[in-house]
């Protein structure tokens, strides 16, 4: 008897680790998404960008969807959301349309139950590109902790889009859970 | 019987509280490491960044290693890695070899297994130090989320090392393990 | 007795389950907090900001405490602390008292144990604000993991409060235990 | 309320030069997009072409080279040459979104220009 | 660039009308619809492709991402009747037409 039941207690020690260890894995989705560099749009206006890649080089995803530009919430939670925009431009690519420019990154959130959008985050700096430097780089990090519910989607909007970097290393934006809702 | 299993339930619960909070700790490797400003390479090249403190003030470290300036993985997992870079300039340090200044980031990831260095993230600004002023500064911040595999190391290089602030708070890197891989 | 051992093994299994979900969420405080917008200080000093809002709009607050201004730790562990802070002048606000600014924010751990502050994190950047330009902007990102204990307390200071931007998604600090301590 | 209204619009000859003004009341047009829009009579609404605070202008492909957008902090000109026929239109002048979005949430009347012999 | 179908439409007050644009290209979710009455400028209903701007009506609803976008208003009114009309806000270079040609709608 005393045996059978502590070698019940391994069975249930042992399923408990394979559970515990397997519902942990599904209970954290995450993503990491870098810019497609074959579908940057032009302007200097504020655009929110649609083309970013999730299954190759540093990108990836789990438990959650992107479509159209937009990575949607499957599980409700508590998400750290970041965004790495960077902007460059080599006088080879000819002139800067001004060289007062305003390089910003807004990170939103879409609720499609009612069809309204809101900026988590925001980050940016005005810039004066002028025309003796041949060279001109800047980058934005933004970062937070937020509440999302299942069928939220979160996009990432910029000013300048012509201006991005295209390098998986420079422009890109993820989310990863770290608990749940109580 | 039935007094004996319930007390052994009570072990099972006991125990397990014990062994899920023992894993959980175990499963969480993390690091936090900080700039040895007695080591900072002069120049305004690109360099690898090779010398961390991993034990004193902020800095900190816990199944992970630190070795010849690299972070290195020893247990396969997704992490958060994030660094932060200060610059800085004093006139009283006397005059910048040029004012316009290339100040950037590169976390970079190295695999031992095939021996090839990839940049995950990198970050930072063109910048124009006139004489003007007395006092120049300027900092970067880059994270994001990665997988991670035992053996894989972390490190940090920077444009213009000369001009780093050496202080803890201000020029760091770090990573924490948030989940396993599938 | 097989199966009554099934049985509170099942019951093993689902209390576990619960005990297991109630004691990861109890084991993560969190706290996003937004600026307060209606209490700004005025000047160009560097001041500790002690006006932030904790349960409107993104901010949420969960087994941390918020008071005067400081952000109060009620469990030992390790945090990712964050803070994202921004500046904006527009001419229509009137002149800049100086074009050469130093924006810059200080994250800093206060132990009343042993009354004494340190800065964990700062970013920043000297900025010349032209009259050239009617619209200013800068923003600063900053993040880092931590080793906090009860009852410390994490407070943000800035220079040139005057230009802070009063949006809950451009000016604010957060942090999320990551795990406990060993 | 916040408002646009177009000015100097009016009969010119094939051939002519002609410049837009749009002013803008109870607003600033600091930090802001600002479109020109056409419409010729009977027809649909014709992008021309946008600017931004400080900043150069983007036009449609074909107003490239006779259409100058130019902006001072309080108005945006449109100018006109080499008109023809095909250039009679009523034009709007519309303000971007406050966001920076390309998004026209503020349109003013509209002034006709006729390009006729 | 922006292709509006269909062209005109008649609708019964209490109906509901559905107009369709097609991008040229993916363009994501920057798109706006507008309303046009005779005589008078355009007025924004719909921006990034489904967000309403205050003050106009829940009956006015868009939708679609990428290339295929769907305006439609539900409980038609008779003060409905205009000239709608869809714009991209993606990309600003080598651009015709940023609008669509328009649907005129008849409110019967």
């Known amino acids: 008897g005393s045996q059978h039941i502590r070698a019940e207690k391994a069975m249930v020690d042992g399923s408990w680790l394979d559970l515990a260890k397997r519902s942990k894995l599904e209970a954290q989705p995450f993503a990491h998404l870098t810019i497609n560099a074959t579908d940057i749009p032009s302007g200097s206006h504020k655009v929110s960008l649609s083309s970013w890649y999730h299954d190759r080089g540093w990108a990836k995803i789990s438990n959650m969807t992107f479509s159209n530009g937009k990575l949607i919430v499957n599980q409700d939670g508590f998400y750290y959301l970041y965004a790495n925009i960077c902007f460059r431009h080599h006088e080879t690519s000819g002139d800067l349309a001004t060289e007062y420019l305003q390089l910003m990154v807004y990170v939103t959130k879409t609720s499609i139950k009612i069809p309204s959008s809101h900026t988590l985050m925001k980050g940016g700096s005005t810039k004066y590109w002028s025309g003796n430097s041949e060279f001109h780089f800047y980058s934005i990090n933004v970062g937070g902790f937020f509440k999302l519910r299942s069928g939220e989607e979160i996009s990432i909007e910029v000013s300048n889009p012509s201006l991005l970097d295209p390098d998986q290393d420079a422009t890109y934006f993820g989310a990863f859970k770290v608990r749940d809702i109580d | 019987g039935s007094q004996h299993i319930r007390a052994e339930k009570a072990m099972v619960d006991g125990s397990w509280l014990d062994l899920a909070k023992r894993s959980k700790l175990e499963a969480q490797p993390f690091a936090h490491l900080t700039i040895n400003a007695t080591d900072i390479p002069s120049g305004s090249h690109k360099v690898s960044l090779s010398s961390w403190y991993h034990d004193r003030g902020w800095a900190k470290i816990s199944n992970m290693t630190f070795s010849n300036g690299k972070l290195i993985v020893n247990q396969d997992g997704f992490y958060y890695l994030y660094a932060n870079i200060c610059f800085r300039h004093h006139e009283t340090s006397g005059d910048l070899a040029t004012e316009y200044l290339q100040l950037m980031v590169y976390v970079t990831k190295t695999s031992i297994k095939i021996p090839s260095s990839h940049t995950l993230m990198k970050g930072g600004s063109t910048k124009y130090w006139s004489g003007n002023s007395e006092f120049h500064f300027y900092s970067i911040n880059v994270g994001g989320f990665f997988k991670l595999r035992s053996g894989e190391e972390i490190s940090i290089e920077v444009s213009n090392p000369s001009l780093l602030d050496p202080d803890q708070d201000a020029t760091y890197f770090g990573a924490f393990k948030v989940r396993d891989i599938d | 007795g097989s199966q009554h051992i099934r049985a509170e093994k099942a019951m093993v299994d689902g209390s576990w389950l619960d005990l297991a979900k109630r004691s990861k969420l109890e084991a993560q405080p969190f706290a996003h907090l937004t600026i307060n917008a209606t209490d700004i200080p005025s000047g160009s000093h560097k001041v500790s900001l002690s006006s932030w809002y904790h349960d409107r709009g993104w901010a949420k607050i969960s087994n941390m405490t918020f008071s005067n201004g400081k952000l109060i730790v009620n469990q030992d562990g390790f945090y990712y602390l964050y803070a994202n802070i921004c500046f904006r002048h527009h001419e229509t606000s009137g002149d800049l008292a100086t074009e050469y600014l130093q924006l810059m924010v200080y994250v800093t751990k206060t132990s009343i144990k042993i009354p004494s502050s340190h800065t964990l994190m700062k970013g920043g950047s000297t900025k010349y604000w032209s009259g050239n330009s009617e619209f200013h902007f800068y923003s600063i990102n900053v993040g880092g993991f931590f080793k906090l204990r009860s009852g410390e307390e994490i407070s943000i200071e800035v220079s040139n409060p005057s230009l802070l931007d009063p949006d809950q998604d451009a000016t604010y600090f957060g942090a999320f235990k990551v795990r406990d301590i060993d | 309320q916040e408002q646009l209204k177009e000015s100097g619009g009016g009969l010119v000859t094939p051939g002519g030069t002609l410049t837009l003004t749009c002013t803008a009341s109870?607003?600033?047009?600091?930090?802001?997009?600002m479109s020109w829009v056409r419409q010729a009579p009977g027809r649909g609404l014709e992008w021309i072409g946008y600017?931004?605070?400080?900043?150069s202008p983007y036009y449609a492909n074909w107003a490239k080279g006779r259409f100058t957008i130019s902006r001072t902090s309080t108005t945006v000109d449109l100018k006109m040459t080499s008109l023809t026929t095909e250039d009679t239109a009523t034009y709007f002048c519309?303000?971007?979104?406050?966001?920076?979005?390309?998004?026209?949430?503020?349109w003013g009347p509209g002034t006709l220009v006729t390009v006729s012999l | 660039d922006m292709i509006q179908t269909p062209a005109s439409v008649e609708v019964a007050v209490g109906g509901t009308v559905t107009i369709n644009c097609q991008a040229s290209?993916?363009?994501?979710?920057?798109l706006a619809w507008y309303q046009q009455k005779p005589g008078q400028p355009p007025k924004l209903l719909i921006y990034?492709?489904?967000t309403l701007p205050s003050g106009v009506p829940s009956r006015f609803k868009g939708s679609g991402s990428g290339t295929q976008f769907t305006f439609t208003i539900s409980d038609v009114e008779c003060t409905d009747a205009a000239t709608y009309y869809c714009?991209?806000?993606?990309?600003?270079?080598?651009?015709?037409?940023?609008f669509g040609g328009g649907t005129e709608v008849v409110v019967k």
């Open positions: 519309a303000r971007h979104a406050s966001d920076g979005g390309w998004y026209l949430d503020i």
């Open positions: 714009q991209q806000a993606y990309t600003a270079s080598n651009v015709d037409n940023a």
């Open positions: 290209q993916s363009i994501g979710s920057n």
């Open positions: 600017i931004y605070s400080g900043g």
């Open positions: 990034l492709a489904s």
């Open positions: 109870r607003f600033s047009l600091i930090n802001i997009g």
